[in-house]
């Protein structure tokens, strides 16, 4: 349905508040280094222009595409060349190449200062003094650090952020009320960002077909009572929403997401019995709730899959007539029966099935050829099951911190060329799979663990893509989306790696470590552990444990010393010497 003015259409659909918020997010995700005030100025200019188009859709420039309008606005930034370098060259291009160019320059790891949380009283004063600016600043700071954050979901986070301050700044103990809420929003926000980053990577690196396959599997698990046609419609709509958001079309994305939520709620009866509560909520909460809704119960007495997909004489005929539809039906039928499988496992099974049909439907006796296809699934199912069992046992034995350390060592030995901060961040997140998933019963462990690992390994892939240093990482990241985790799991110690030169400075610590939070102190220790492995990749677990124990004792002792700095200097020298001796250097 073509509109004379796209900008007027979106302004009317979304309302001024959401329009302004989404334009701010879009601009901050593109120009990540620009000051807040500059972005607010640009957003106000766009908003004023949109209002003129609402008043008269035939007014000058109102017929231009949103990319043209927004791109033109971004290209007015005076310091574009100095701040962004070659990104300024995007402005010489025409749409749609200009927008593609901006997208390619999004930085997953922008050089921005860590967000330091001010004192509660300072935050409450700022909130009361100018609520609108305070909330815009939140959107800006999150969007520029997470350039693929799912924009309509960020509006939901901002709503919760506002609610937290509204409630807690009036509380008797502001800090006790506010800080846990902010911690929760921060942790959920990081998780939400990483999940969306995988969706965008899936679309951008592997194409729409890969994303649709993922969506068929996930929605079929979630809505096992829905018909295939219903699931297919939802998949098509969801793909459009995420394609738009990942492409920077945030106004269209938010609008289409609202339409999808509306459709789902109007058709609950044919989708899922679990949607009732979600559908009673306001728009932002509703969309979030639907996205997180638990799996519906599986229909009783579902027939065996073998009848339609192995035993039927029409398998090759049905496959040949409409390959993707037939494979989609296979994936739908398998997924709705297996909420206990990870989505990536379901996709591996579908890929195996597809490969078998491709081979067998060209054979002399197709049925004879594909008759045992389900037997090929067994090892594919057992591999993640065994891996999760082993790692949950290790997690239960070690606890989260030491489990993270085991993974740090494992992954540093696999891909020692990767930067230390990336190895620490990724391994810490991999290690969180333990507390996140190992508590679940068997039936929920695999979807929790393996799909979470896919999200974390995608972080490694996008960070590595910015500065590629390891062919092995590139290979695992690019060959197959669904086999990324098995690819990394299969990597052994990199025998080609030349150990890093020993640098005492890397292992020099100061009294400032004593004032760090427990988390920051862990990160310091884990950074040292990665550097140790890079320095001595053949070190045994026992050797590394001895050195890390020494390091922990060193920090504990010096942080209790009267003259901390002297202790760190003197004991530090001895720690380095003791470590070198322990590692046989």
């Amino acid at each position: 349905d073509a509109h004379k003015s796209e900008v007027a259409h979106r302004f009317k659909d979304l309302g001024e508040e959401n329009f302004k918020a989404l334009v701010l997010i879009a601009f901050a995700q593109y120009l990540q280094q620009c000051p807040f005030e500059d972005h607010v100025k640009l957003v106000n200019e766009v908003t004023e222009f949109a209002k003129t188009c609402v008043a008269d859709e035939s007014a000058e420039n109102c017929d231009k595409s949103l990319h043209t309008l927004f791109g033109d606005k971004l290209c007015t930034v005076a310091t574009l060349r100095e701040t962004y370098g070659e990104m300024a060259d995007c402005c010489a291009k025409q749409e749609p190449e200009r927008n593609e160019c901006f997208l390619q320059h999004k930085d997953d790891n922008p050089n921005l200062p860590r967000l330091v949380r001010p004192e509660v009283d300072v935050m409450c004063t700022a909130f009361h003094d100018n609520e609108e600016t305070f909330l815009k600043k939140y959107l800006y700071e999150i969007a520029r650090r997470h350039p693929y954050f799912y924009a309509p979901e960020l509006l939901f986070f901002a709503k919760r952020y506002k609610a937290a301050f509204t409630e807690c700044c009036q509380a008797a103990d502001k800090a006790a009320c506010l800080l846990p809420k902010l911690d929760e929003l921060r942790d959920e926000g990081k998780a939400s960002s990483a999940k969306q980053r995988l969706k965008c990577a899936s679309l951008q690196k592997f194409g729409e077909r890969a994303f649709k396959a993922w969506a068929v599997a996930r929605l079929s698990q979630r809505f096992p009572k829905a018909e295939f046609a219903e699931v297919s419609k939802l998949v098509t709509d969801l793909t459009k929403v995420h394609t738009e958001c990942c492409h920077g079309d945030l106004l269209e994305c938010a609008d289409d997401r609202a339409d999808l939520a509306k459709y789902i709620c109007e058709n609950q009866d044919s989708i899922s019995s679990k949607l009732k509560e979600c559908c009673e909520k306001p728009l932002l909460e509703k969309s979030h709730c639907i996205a997180e809704v638990e799996n519906d119960e599986m229909p009783a007495d579902l027939p065996s899959l073998a009848a339609d997909f192995v035993e039927s004489k029409d398998v090759c005929k049905n496959y040949a007539e409409a390959k993707d539809v037939f494979l989609g039906m296979f994936l739908y039928e398998y997924a709705r029966r297996h909420p206990d499988y990870s989505v990536v496992l379901l996709l591996r099974l579908a890929k195996t099935y597809e490969t078998t049909l491709e081979k067998c439907c060209a054979a002399a006796d197709p049925h004879e050829c594909y008759a045992k296809v389900f037997d090929e699934f067994k090892p594919l199912v057992e591999e993640p099951q065994n891996l999760i069992k082993q790692n949950c046992e290790l997690f239960e034995q070690l606890g989260e911190y030491k489990f993270q350390n085991a993974l740090l060592v494992r992954y540093t030995k696999k891909v020692p060329q990767v930067s230390t901060p990336t190895l620490v961040e990724v391994s810490r997140n991999l290690g969180k799979v333990g507390s996140k998933c190992c508590k679940h019963p068997e039936a929920k462990r695999m979807p929790c663990a393996e799909d979470y690992l896919s999200v974390v390994l995608n972080q490694l892939c996008v960070l590595h893509e910015k500065t590629p240093v390891s062919d092995r990482v590139t290979k695992c990241c690019t060959e197959s989306l669904v086999n990324r985790r098995p690819c990394f799991s299969a990597l052994e110690v990199d025998e080609t790696y030349v150990p890093k030169e020993f640098n005492a400075e890397t292992f020099t610590f100061h009294a400032d470590i004593c004032t760090l939070s427990e988390k920051e102190r862990q990160i310091k220790k884990q950074t040292a552990l990665v550097e140790l492995v890079k320095h001595k990749p053949k070190a045994t677990k026992e050797q590394l444990k001895a050195v890390m124990d020494d390091f922990a004792a060193f920090v504990e002792k010096c942080c209790k010393a009267d003259d901390k700095e002297t202790c760190f200097a003197e004991e530090g020298k001895k720690l380095v010497a003791a470590s070198q001796a322990a590692l046989g250097l």
Partner: nanobody
Framework: EVQLVESGGGLVQPGRSLRSCAAS????????MHWVRQAPGKGLEWVSG????????TYADSVKGRFTISRDNAKNSLYLQMNSLRAEDTALYYC????????????????WGRGTLVTVSS
């Protein structure tokens, strides 16, 4: 205040004997510990050292294979098991705290006990 109190001295037959040292007034597991001895009319001789958690242990050549140093951080105690004792092992045995957690380079003896006399006699 730092206190190191040795026990297990006296007249011993050639064979085996255990010295122990009770530590107090400081965080025991923050320090390496040593045994140092002084034979009658002779200078001080370092015998053995043990790092903060017992991972690194060193011995003087004169006692290697015969003496075993150990520690129990939960009990704030240091031990020296002496086997195959000889007359030349007769000495005043001191329990000594290092300044460091680690056994690397030359030891830095920071606090001494009063010593316990071991006399080996057949």
């Amino acid at each position: 205040e730092v206190q190191l109190v040795e026990s297990g001295g006296g007249l011993v037959q050639p064979g085996r004997s255990l010295r122990s040292c009770a530590a107090s007034g400081f965080t025991f597991h923050h320090y390496a510990m040593h045994w140092v001895r002084q034979a009658p009319g002779k200078g001080l001789e370092w015998v053995s050292g043990i790092s903060w958690n017992g991972n690194k242990i060193t011995y003087a050549d004169s006692v290697k294979g015969r003496f075993t140093i150990s520690r129990d951080n939960a009990k704030n105690s240091l031990y020296l098991q002496m086997n195959s004792l000889r007359a030349e092992d007769t000495a005043l045995y001191y329990c000594v705290r290092d300044s460091s957690l680690f056994i690397v380079g030359a030891p830095t003896f920071e606090h001494w006990g009063r010593g316990t006399l071991v006399t080996v006699s057949s």
